[in-house]
């Protein structure tokens, strides 16, 4: 058993049918010695008397808010949460496996640039009685500070018969060094509590591996005289790191017909313009990627050919 | 060419070669399903690798003030990786495919290090750790880790030379 925060304790349990559970001794936080009784949650049933209460915790029915009283007055509370271990593996019931980029991916994180700011998000089908707490650091043995805000509900989607809820959090490395080569990964730890269940989720990454630039901005077409060709031009997104002579992007320009089956013409360039042939009813799209490190491509910015 | 005395390197040549290094490093080890090599007991390998750190002057301001600190750090790294790629980690079993980009990568690392430091001048170089994995699978894992680490290193080097070529070239 360990303390999550003041008066909230986590009991770690091996979880299988007829498991013996864990013996827990609760102590009433009071100088009083006599006439103390104990109850659980909203029940008035007296579970025991005395300054300490010994319980065998086997299932969620044994967890909850234990309260010690004397003469109708509440003396103190202890909230017991359970953390399940099934076949030697901590449970992951609360969050959905996003399966991208690999199985058992519960937290996904992205950064728009090298400033040390990043966003992480996760999914759940649980709608109520859910709290998250996020901590982060650079490295684990001698951790350097990363400050995270509060996790917030950022999206709701209908998936078949169920609703899916997306939560996200923004974090910022306290002393970020955008130009340096990272040697220690960022660690992100999310504590999730649903009703009386505690779970924790972690992710470890380098900022360079989670970079995904915003799409190029100000995408424009300029027809070339007496030609089906057009000059496409665009700019670096505002959110990208500066100076651009140092933090350079590379671009992919695509001409796509109306039908998805039509052949796509693609051009790769380090410049912020390109000359392409504009077909009728086609659209031109441009996306960006770090020029020197193959992290994610941005989403496409698009304009119609006409 | 960069000399320890402090004259400028051939920024544009360095830019071109470092960008080629980036391409080669990624073709030598593309991101295989985002294989997370950090889970595989990283400490002994990549802790000894020279990283371009915050105080090395490789940021735009540091380059403007005095690019020599940064260039020396990059040179150290290039020599380090050049030796690793020439070691039995890469020459031993399992043999690399004949068309593997590792050979080109090795040659380009050497080429860029020579651009930075002509013969007769010597910056101190870092000691190569004695990594001699006994099993072929260990060697394979070590290759992946070294290449992943090299990708990060050459990305920073390429940024330095691109910025230098754009802003510091005479």
């Amino acid at each position: 058993i360990w303390e999550l925060k003041k008066d909230v304790y986590v009991v770690e349990l091996d979880w299988y049918p007829d498991a013996p559970g864990e013996m827990v001794v609760l102590t009433c936080d009071t100088p009083e010695e006599d006439g103390i009784t104990w109850t659980l949650d909203q029940s008035s049933e007296v579970l025991g008397s005395g300054k300490t209460l010994t319980i065998q915790v086997k299932e969620f029915g044994d967890a909850g808010q234990y309260t010690c009283h004397k003469g109708g007055e509440v003396l103190s509370h202890s909230l017991l949460l359970l953390h399940k271990k099934e076949d030697g593996i901590w449970s992951t019931d609360i969050l959905k496996d996003q399966k991208e980029p690999k199985n058992k991916t519960f937290l996904r994180c992205e950064a728009k640039n090298y400033s040390g700011r990043f966003t992480c998000w996760w999914l759940t089908t649980i709608s109520t009685d859910l709290t998250f707490s996020v901590k982060s650091s650079r490295g684990s043995s001698d951790p350097q500070g990363v400050t995270c805000g509060a996790a917030t509900l950022s999206a709701e989607r209908v998936r078949g018969d169920n609703k899916e809820y997306e939560y996200s959090v923004e974090c910022q490395e306290d002393s970020a060094c955008p130009a340096a080569e990272e040697s220690l990964p960022i660690e992100v730890m999310v504590d999730a509590v649903h009703k009386l269940k505690y779970e924790n989720y972690t992710s470890s990454f380098f900022i360079r591996d989670i970079i995904k630039p915003d799409p190029p901005k100000n995408l424009q077409l300029k027809p070339l005289k007496n030609s089906r060709q057009v000059e496409v031009s665009w700019e670096y997104p505002d959110t990208w790191s500066t100076p651009h002579s140092y933090f350079s992007l590379t671009f992919c320009v695509q001409v796509q017909g109306k039908s998805k089956r039509e052949k796509k013409d693609r051009v790769f360039t380090d410049k912020t313009s390109a000359t392409v042939i504009c077909r009728k009813n086609a659209s031109i799209s441009v996306r960006a990627q770090d020029r020197y490190y193959s992290s994610s491509w941005s989403e496409w910015a698009s304009v119609p050919c006409s | 060419r960069a000399v320890p005395g402090g004259s400028s390197p051939a920024w544009t040549q360095c830019q071109q070669l470092s960008q080629k290094l980036c391409t080669l490093a990624w073709s030598a080890h593309p991101l295989v399903g985002h294989m997370d090599l950090r889970e595989e007991g990283d400490e002994e390998t990549t802790n000894d690798v020279p990283h371009i750190q915050c105080g090395d002057g490789c940021d735009p301001q540091g380059l403007r003030d005095n690019s020599q600190f940064c260039l020396q750090r990059i040179h150290q790294g290039l020599i380090f990786y050049e030796k690793l790629l020439g070691s039995d980690i890469f020459t031993g079993e399992p043999s690399l495919l004949p068309d593997s980009p590792v050979g080109q990568l090795h040659a380009s690392l050497l080429g860029l290090s020579q651009l930075l430091q002509p013969e007769g001048h010597h910056w101190e170089t870092q000691q190569i750790p004695s990594l001699s994995p006994s099993q072929p699978w260990q060697r394979l894992l070590l290759r992946f880790k070294i290449l992943r680490s090299l990708q990060a290193f050459v990305a920073v080097a390429a940024r330095v030379f691109a910025h230098g070529a754009a802003t510091l070239s005479p």
């Epitope: 009685d129 169920n162 009703k195 | -």
Partner: nanobody
């Protein structure tokens, strides 16, 4: 709209059996735990039995252990309560309830969705 609909209640003699059913709709309950609660006239709603999302873990109130069996059909979104050797103290309105998140609880306050209830009366 999420709905839990109980059926199977009725008036029986002491010693008889009844099988209660609960049909769940409006969402997939495959990841939810399900429970049965009962409320006798003038008393609080109390826990009877519950089953986790996969059906492999069940829990019972002391007074019904060995007589009642809870089960579920995940495909049909159904939960059942087989009640044997009924006694007059089993009389009350029986409610089906669901809680998100795989595991069952014994406290009514933890359940997210409730049915309207079905009356069970056991005469002596």
């Amino acid at each position: 709209e999420v709905q839990l609909v109980e059926s199977g209640g009725g008036l029986v003699q002491a010693g008889d059996s009844l099988r209660l059913s609960c049909a769940a709709s409006g969402r997939s309950f495959s990841n939810d735990a399900m429970g049965w609660f009962r409320q006798a006239p003038g008393k609080e709603r109390s826990f009877v039995a519950a089953i986790n999302w996969s059906g492999e873990l069940t829990g019972y109130a002391g007074s019904v252990k060995g007589r009642f069996t809870i089960s579920r059909d995940g495909v049909e979104n159904m939960v059942f309560l087989q009640m044997n050797s009924l006694v007059p103290e089993d009389t009350g309105v029986y409610y089906c309830a669901a809680v998100e998140g795989r595991d069952y609880y014994r406290g009514a306050q933890y359940y997210d969705y409730w049915g309207q209830g079905t009356q069970v009366t056991v005469s002596s």
